[in-house]
């Protein structure tokens, strides 16, 4: 007959390494009589016999975890007791080993240049995986701007254009390596104008090309504004190369204007814009007339029919293909602008414009246009249209353009010949002579220039009837 024997654990439990989803087995060999009752604990909590995740065999001496999970990590103990002496216990650790796994992979990112970008890469694994990053085909080197955080995420301070590209994170431990999918880091750059349009001073009827170059990511679009409104005429040519957009606005110049190039690109729901402006001013019409070729002919148009002297010969500029049609179209455009001016100014301005665009002509061997006399020009500017003229000059200085006289091909009075110097060298405006006889009072006007610049012009107030200084007879 066997003697009772207290349990002795002959094979103590050892640390077991197991991979997730694999089988892990603890063996607890016990010698005793009578046969012991063996129970198992995990982290001091009893493992129930009916728990289907475990298999307990060989009279309880073999504990098998059928499919290891990362949560099975812990201290496993077997306790043997047969009522003889005390219960005995042996414990061992289960270390769940895990190939690297990327639990939060990076995603595509669009970021504006200069901001901070963070590409996430959260990993699991045992041993803890080390995380590195690849950009394109090369390992990414950390520097003062680029760092891999403890969490595995990639942080880029002050993002630059050259940071754009394809990235992936790599998680590595002794059991293997995991790669994330390739993600794209797109660096967006606010629209910026590289080359602003240049201002031009040209003669009437010239072609001018305004050029504006802009850069940005995405490539900006360029639009043109003329005097605060969308450009109504001219042709726009665009080309894009290496994220640079080049826009050329070709204009046929019939009026001065402020042209603004606006470069715009979109960043999510927001837009960035950059602007640059140039002015196109019209060189002295009479000067361009002198320098240009042309011919003398009777005016046969409609717009200036009531203003110009009957049967007078006027100068037509052959820098236009159809000079008579072209000059008529110019005056027609100017006429529409005059709708905005006062009833006092309008007829005087019409007289000035018609005689300026259709200058009296001396046939001769070389047809020569005859400009308006300075005194008549100043009368329109300083008396009839003083308010409009001052408003126009103020707006021009501030770069503001609205409807009214600023778009008109008005002469620069100071550059015109004086009738007092040579009465035959310039043209008088009969309308103003008529008004001189019929109008007795004028509103007070402060001269926009010192009176020294204005021959025969009173300093502040003027009345044709009263002031002989404004002599036009």
């Amino acid at each position: 007959e066997k003697l009772p024997k207290a349990p002795v654990i002959t094979t103590p439990l050892e640390t077991v390494d197991a991979l997730v989803e694999e089988v892990a087995t603890f063996m607890c060999a016990v010698e005793s009589y009578p046969q012991p009752e063996i129970s198992w604990t995990r982290n001091k909590i009893l493992i129930k016999l009916f728990d289907t995740r475990y298999s307990i065999r060989e009279n309880g001496q073999l504990l098998t975890i059928l499919s290891v999970e990362d949560s099975d990590d812990g201290i496993y103990c077997c306790i043997a007791n047969n009522g003889v002496g005390g219960a005995v216990e042996s414990c061992g650790a289960l270390q769940v080993k895990m190939k690297p796994k990327i639990t939060r992979p990076p995603i595509n990112v669009k970021i504006i240049e200069g901001l901070k970008a963070v590409l996430p890469c959260t990993t699991m694994g045992n041993p803890k995986p080390s995380v590195s990053w690849i950009k394109g085909d090369n390992a990414l080197r950390e520097n003062s701007r680029i760092a891999v955080l403890e969490s595995g995420s990639l942080r880029i301070h002050n993002v630059q254009k050259e940071d754009a590209g394809q990235y992936r994170c790599v998680a590595k431990n002794s059991l293997g390596t995991a790669y994330s999918k390739l993600v794209k880091l797109e660096v967006e750059v606010f629209a910026r104008i590289l080359r602003a349009p240049e201002s031009h001073n040209v003669t009437f009827g010239s072609f001018v090309t305004l050029r504006c170059t802009a850069i940005g990511i995405p490539v900006p679009t360029i639009s043109w504004i003329e005097n605060g409104n969308a450009v109504s005429s001219g042709s726009i040519q665009e080309s894009v190369k290496d994220r640079v957009i080049d826009s050329r606005l070709q204009l046929f110049i019939t009026k001065p204007g402020l042209y603004t190039c606006i470069a715009t690109n979109k960043h999510g729901e927001k837009f960035s814009t950059a602007k640059a402006a140039a002015t196109v001013s019209i060189a002295e019409w009479s000067k361009s007339q002198k320098d240009s070729q042309g011919y003398c002919a009777q005016y046969r148009g409609e717009v200036c029919d009531a203003v110009l002297a009957k049967d007078a010969l006027v100068f037509f500029n052959t820098s236009y293909r159809d000079p008579e049609d072209a000059q008529e179209l110019l005056i027609h455009t100017a006429w529409n602008e005059l709708k905005a001016v006062s009833p006092l100014c309008r007829p005087a301005a019409e007289a000035l414009l018609c005689n300026h665009l259709f200058q009296e002509c001396s046939p001769g061997v070389v047809p020569t246009p005859m400009p308006i006399c300075r005194e008549y020009c100043l009368a329109v500017k300083e008396l009839f249209c003083a308010k409009e003229w001052q408003a126009m000059e103020g707006k021009a200085h501030r770069g503001l353009y609205r409807s009214g006289m600023h778009l008109l091909p008005v002469p620069e009075c100071s550059k015109l010949p004086s009738m007092h110097r040579d009465p035959t060298a310039c043209t008088r405006l009969p309308y103003l002579d008529y008004k001189k006889e019929n109008i007795t009072t004028f509103p007070s006007i402060t001269s926009s220039r010192p009176s020294a610049d204005i021959p025969n012009l009173p300093a502040s107030t003027s009345s044709f009837a009263v002031s002989p200084a404004y002599s036009m007879t």
């Epitope: 009827g205 148009g301 052959t318 179209l329």
Partner: antibody, heavy 119, light 112 residues
Framework: EVQLVESGGGLVQPGGSLRLSCAAS????????LNWVRQAPGKGLEWVSY????????DYADSVKGRFTISRDNAKNSLYLQMNSLRDEDTAVYYC????????????WGQGTLVTVSS | DIVMTQSPLSLPVTPGEPASISCRSS???????????LDWYLQKPGQSPQLLIY???NRASGVPDRFSGSGSGTDFTLKINRVEAEDVGVYYC?????????FGQGTKLEIK
Amino acid sequence: EVQLVESGGGLVQPGGSLRLSCAASGFTFSSYRLNWVRQAPGKGLEWVSYISSSTGSLDYADSVKGRFTISRDNAKNSLYLQMNSLRDEDTAVYYCARRSPYTGSLDNWGQGTLVTVSS
Amino acid sequence: DIVMTQSPLSLPVTPGEPASISCRSSQSLLHSNGYNYLDWYLQKPGQSPQLLIYLGSNRASGVPDRFSGSGSGTDFTLKINRVEAEDVGVYYCMQALQTPYTFGQGTKLEIK
């Protein structure tokens, strides 16, 4: 937007007459020189006639002189081509075209109207 | 009358390749004002002609920059630096120097 719309084309017998119209919009009609240009089926373009804006001057291709008359009504923004003594060789699509007084180019064209002269 | 002569009359081109059309006038189109009164027009299939180039070398509004015009006096060239499928049609040169305004015979550009 500049628009030119021709009308009045159709089938006519040799020796017959037809009047084409061109309705214009979107620009200062009275300030532009207007032209008629035609294109015989499968052939190239042939200038027919022009009428100026301000001067009322006009001209014709030799092939239509004395038979065709160009006119305009600035109040109605309309251009016309009266075609008399029509011949087989006048069969063509007739286009109305606006001429830029600055550059001389035909910068806007209508869609055309087909004139067929046949017995 | 000024006679305009275009060559070639037919021009098969592979998309992306350049194309060049020549236009010769029987007398100089250079006006005393310094401008060459030579225009280029394109007539796409089933459409009206449209202005491409005016005064010899100026692109009209909305014309892509792959089109360019050059030349002076009696010899002019229209170049397309990279032909696209939408460029097919008949190209005409026209002199606007004097009446009667005259056109070239036309060059038919087609895609190979």
